[in-house]
Each structure stands twice: as structure tokens, then as C-alpha cells.
Interface confidence: low
């Protein structure tokens, strides 16, 4: 982009500030909150998106309290620490010096502790199960049509390679999308399943992160697929470490 061009925007992330101040006058976009340069040719990391979301003026936010994730993400929204590549830092702390360890999608995987808490590595979430309940329809969706449409959505809208969509299960009215991506499978340039799941989650809530694109209009053979509840389960490569007290 040159300075004269007025379409300097980030198509994959509207929570950015863009200006033509990159090399050769090219458009460069920085995430709100962190000020980090983002690659607008692909999805922005969930960590930078959460940070941007928390930095937005309170009255400008249209937040849905994430009660529907209570089973899996009890802590909900927080202002995360991101590393220079935009990934979650393994240890997260709040302003009162309470700390905890998170996985690669930013979900707490240990009990909360103090500043002495050690989180040796960022543990990868390699399996995500997205559990959807759709609104009643005249009849059940055809499973293979639903499967094809959801795979197309993840490939075309979120640019997630189809090999990472492990399965689509359907028992009316419940749809389950399984995303799997081991560390060894993820090549340079591949979209992370955690980021794709987060964009999908925001789309489903009507809070699209894409710049200027219409909201998600999901149809199966022309029939609208309207989701009324979403649950997302995260499985890590190393099991989480919670005390027995929390498990009872």
C-alpha cells in the first residue's frame, strides 16, 4: 500500500490500527492493546485478540459473559500476557499477583497460585471439541451435507487445513466438530486450531472479528443453521494439574 491508498485495513482482524507506514509505504496493522504488528493474511492469535478485546473502551465492547463455557473455561475473559510471537505466555498473573498456568489456547490448566508458581512450558492444546446445539428445524440436517459445509467453512473462512478437522458428528440437535493438531503436524503458515476455534466461537456469537465481512451466514442446502448454545472442550498434550479439592 502507498500513503495515498485509503483501504489500509486488516481484513482478518478489525481490532487493529492500520497505517501505511510499513516498508515502501505498505500497509502495516497493529493489534489494539499490545501494539504488536499482525499478519493480516491469516488469523490473528487468540492471545492478541483477547488482549485487544480487554483494551477496548468498556462502552465500546459488546461482550457476552461467557457463561456457556462454564464447564470448560471458568475464568472467561482476562487480560493475557502474550509472547513476541503473539502466543500465550505459559504463566499468567493478574494485578493482585495471583498466577496460574495456561495451555496454548489460554485456558487455565493449574490451580491458582502466587508469583512463585512455575509454568515450565506452554502446553499445546491438540484436540478441541466444539459442541453446538442448533435451533429446531423442520427436519434433521443431512449429516454428509452438514459435514461438508462445516469443513468448507473452516477451510475457506478460517483457512484451517481440512486435515485438522478430524470429524463432524451429528445427532439432532447436537453437532460436534473435532479439531486435532499435534505439534508435529503444524507446519509454518498453518492456522492454529485454537485460533480457528476462537474465530468460529466469536462468529457464532455474532461478534465477527473479520473486517467489514458480513456476519456468519451458515446454511446447509439453503437451510439456515442457527446455533443456540456452544460448549468448547480443550484437551492438552499433557493432562492438566488440578488439586483433588477442585475436582470434587
Amino acid at each position: 500500500h502507498t500513503a495515498a491508498q485509503d483501504n489500509c485495513t486488516c481484513p482478518t482482524n478489525k481490532m487493529t490500527v492500520c497505517s501505511p507506514d510499513g516498508p515502501g509505504g505498505r500497509c502495516q496493522c497493529r493489534a489494539l492493546g499490545s501494539g504488536m504488528a499482525v499478519d493480516c493474511s491469516t488469523l490473528t492469535s487468540k492471545c492478541l485478540l483477547l488482549k485487544a478485546r480487554m483494551s477496548a473502551p468498556k462502552n465500546a465492547r459488546t461482550l457476552v459473559r461467557p457463561s456457556e463455557h462454564a464447564l470448560v473455561d471458568n475464568d472467561g475473559l482476562y487480560d493475557p500476557d502474550c509472547d513476541p510471537e503473539g502466543r500465550f505466555k505459559a504463566r499468567q498473573c493478574n494485578q493482585t499477583s495471583v498466577c496460574w498456568c495456561v495451555n496454548s489456547v489460554g485456558v487455565r490448566r493449574t490451580d491458582k497460585g502466587d508469583l512463585s508458581l512455575r509454568c515450565d512450558e506452554l502446553v499445546r492444546t491438540h484436540h478441541i471439541l466444539i459442541d453446538l446445539r442448533h435451533r429446531p428445524t423442520a427436519g434433521a440436517f443431512n449429516h454428509s451435507d452438514l459435514d461438508a459445509e462445516l469443513r468448507r467453512l473452516f477451510r475457506e473462512r478460517y483457512r484451517l487445513h481440512p486435515k485438522f478437522v478430524a470429524a463432524v458428528h451429528y445427532e439432532q440437535p447436537t453437532i460436534q466438530i473435532e479439531l486435532r493438531q499435534n505439534t508435529s503436524q503444524k507446519a509454518a503458515g498453518d492456522v492454529d486450531i485454537g485460533d480457528a476455534a476462537y474465530y468460529f466461537e466469536r462468529d457464532i456469537k455474532g461478534e465477527s472479528l473479520f473486517q467489514g465481512r458480513g456476519g456468519l451466514d451458515l446454511r446447509v442446502r439453503g437451510e439456515p443453521l442457527q446455533v443456540e448454545r456452544t460448549l468448547i472442550y480443550y484437551l492438552d498434550e499433557i493432562p492438566p494439574k488440578f488439586s483433588m479439592k477442585r475436582l470434587t
Partner: antibody, heavy 121, light 107 residues
């Protein structure tokens, strides 16, 4: 509907310069890479290189470094291939094609119709 | 550079036949292989990517398989409109490279 519309056929003399355009529509231009491919008469397809439409960074195959140059006019959703100091052996058809950005996505899902370039004195 | 070798330049077939085209990579390309169909005077058309994934709108008679260095493209029941040149391409690493093409023609 996603499409790539290429400029028309070109007749040039050796030593001249040609610029081929490829106008994208139906998708956000900066969310896909633009690849360029050469199709020699009676021969197969040969990759010239690609340009990252968001960063503007080009990458060329070894055989095409020097005289071949990619550029963008993002506001017009258009990519360009310029060939300078034309030689007779540059006579062929040139295709633009859309791709993703990472190696898992370097397949070409949408192609332009091709631009025939003829170099003759 | 990775060389993609399509062993048959021409393959003769009849309508209704099952036909398989092979492609061999000079080094391991995992499953990063695409297959294209090109008809005279037209641009190539993507059929298969990542070895076995059928592109949107491609009929299910077209399938792909393989990994590492050996790949196969199959048409389960050839239709008259399938007569064309088929190219394999590795999308594993740059420079991206194509096979020389296999022309499918009627017996």
C-alpha cells in the same frame, strides 16, 4: 463468484517490456497469495513465483530471477507480472492463480484465463 | 528442486473405465500434492489438494491418494468430459514444481 481476470494478448519485440495484469474479484484480495505460472507451448506448467498480497513480498523461482517482477495495486485488487528485456523464448502463456500463504496452502484453487505473450522481431 | 515424475505421457481409456495416474516425487513431500485438469485453450482446474482432499464442487469420481514420494490420482468411471491433461504439483516447498502432465485420450 471468485475470479481472476487477466489482460489481453501481447505482441512485443525482443528487448521490450511487457506488463500483464490480473484483477481479482469475489474475495478479499489481501487474504490470498498470488502465484504466477508459465505454460510453454506443447510443454508443461512451470512455476515463476508468488507474491504475498498483504506484505507485498515477492518470491521468484531461480530461473525467473532478474527480468521478471511482481507488483500489486491493492486498492484495485490487481497483481502484475512485468517481464523486461524480452527474449524470443519468453513467447508463451502466463497464468495468475490464487493460493494460500503457508506451504500447506500452496495449491492453486482459482486461475486466470491466461495471457499469451508473443515476442517477435 | 523437487522433481515430480508422471510416468505416462499418454493414457488411453474408454468411457466408464477406471483409470489411475501416478506421480513420483524425487524426495519426501509428505501429503502436499495437488492434481489439476487442463483442457485445450483453458486454464488448469484444481481437483485434489493435499494428496486426497477433493476441492469444492469436484465430482466424487475423482480421488487422490499417497504420501511421501508416491501419489495416485484415480477417476473411478471416466466420462467423455474427463479427457484432458492431468498435472500433479507438489506444494510442500518452493520452488513449487509440476509433473510433465498425463494426457487422457480415448482408445
Amino acid at each position: 463468484q471468485i475470479q481472476l481476470v487477466q489482460s489481453g494478448p501481447e505482441l512485443k519485440k525482443p528487448g521490450e517490456t511487457v506488463r500483464i495484469s490480473c484483477k481479482a474479484s469475489g474475495y478479499t484480495f489481501t487474504t490470498a497469495g498470488m502465484q504466477w505460472v508459465q505454460k510453454m507451448p506443447g510443454k508443461g506448467l512451470k512455476w515463476i513465483g508468488w507474491i504475498n498480497t498483504h506484505s507485498g513480498v515477492p518470491k521468484y523461482a531461480e530461473d525467473f530471477k532478474g527480468r521478471f517482477a511482481f507488483s500489486l495495486e491493492t486498492s484495485a485488487s490487481t497483481a502484475y507480472l512485468q517481464i523486461s528485456n524480452l527474449k524470443n523464448e519468453d513467447t508463451t502463456t502466463y497464468f495468475c492463480a490464487r493460493s494460500g500463504f503457508g506451504s500447506s496452502y500452496w495449491y492453486f484453487d482459482v486461475w486466470g484465463a491466461g495471457t499469451a505473450v508473443t515476442v517477435s522481431s | 528442486d523437487i522433481v515430480m515424475t508422471q510416468s505416462h505421457k499418454f493414457m488411453s481409456t474408454s468411457v466408464g473405465d477406471r483409470v489411475s495416474i501416478t506421480c513420483k516425487a524425487s524426495q519426501d513431500v509428505s501429503t502436499a500434492v495437488a492434481w489439476y485438469q487442463q483442457k485445450p485453450g483453458q486454464s488448469p482446474k484444481l481437483l485434489i489438494y493435499s494428496a486426497s482432499y477433493r476441492y469444492t464442487g469436484v465430482p466424487d469420481r475423482f480421488t487422490g491418494s499417497g504420501s511421501g514420494t508416491a501419489f495416485t490420482f484415480t477417476i473411478s468411471s471416466v466420462q467423455a468430459e474427463d479427457l484432458a491433461v492431468y498435472y500433479c504439483q507438489q506444494h510442500y516447498i518452493t520452488p513449487l514444481t509440476f509433473g510433465a502432465g498425463t494426457k487422457l485420450e480415448l482408445k
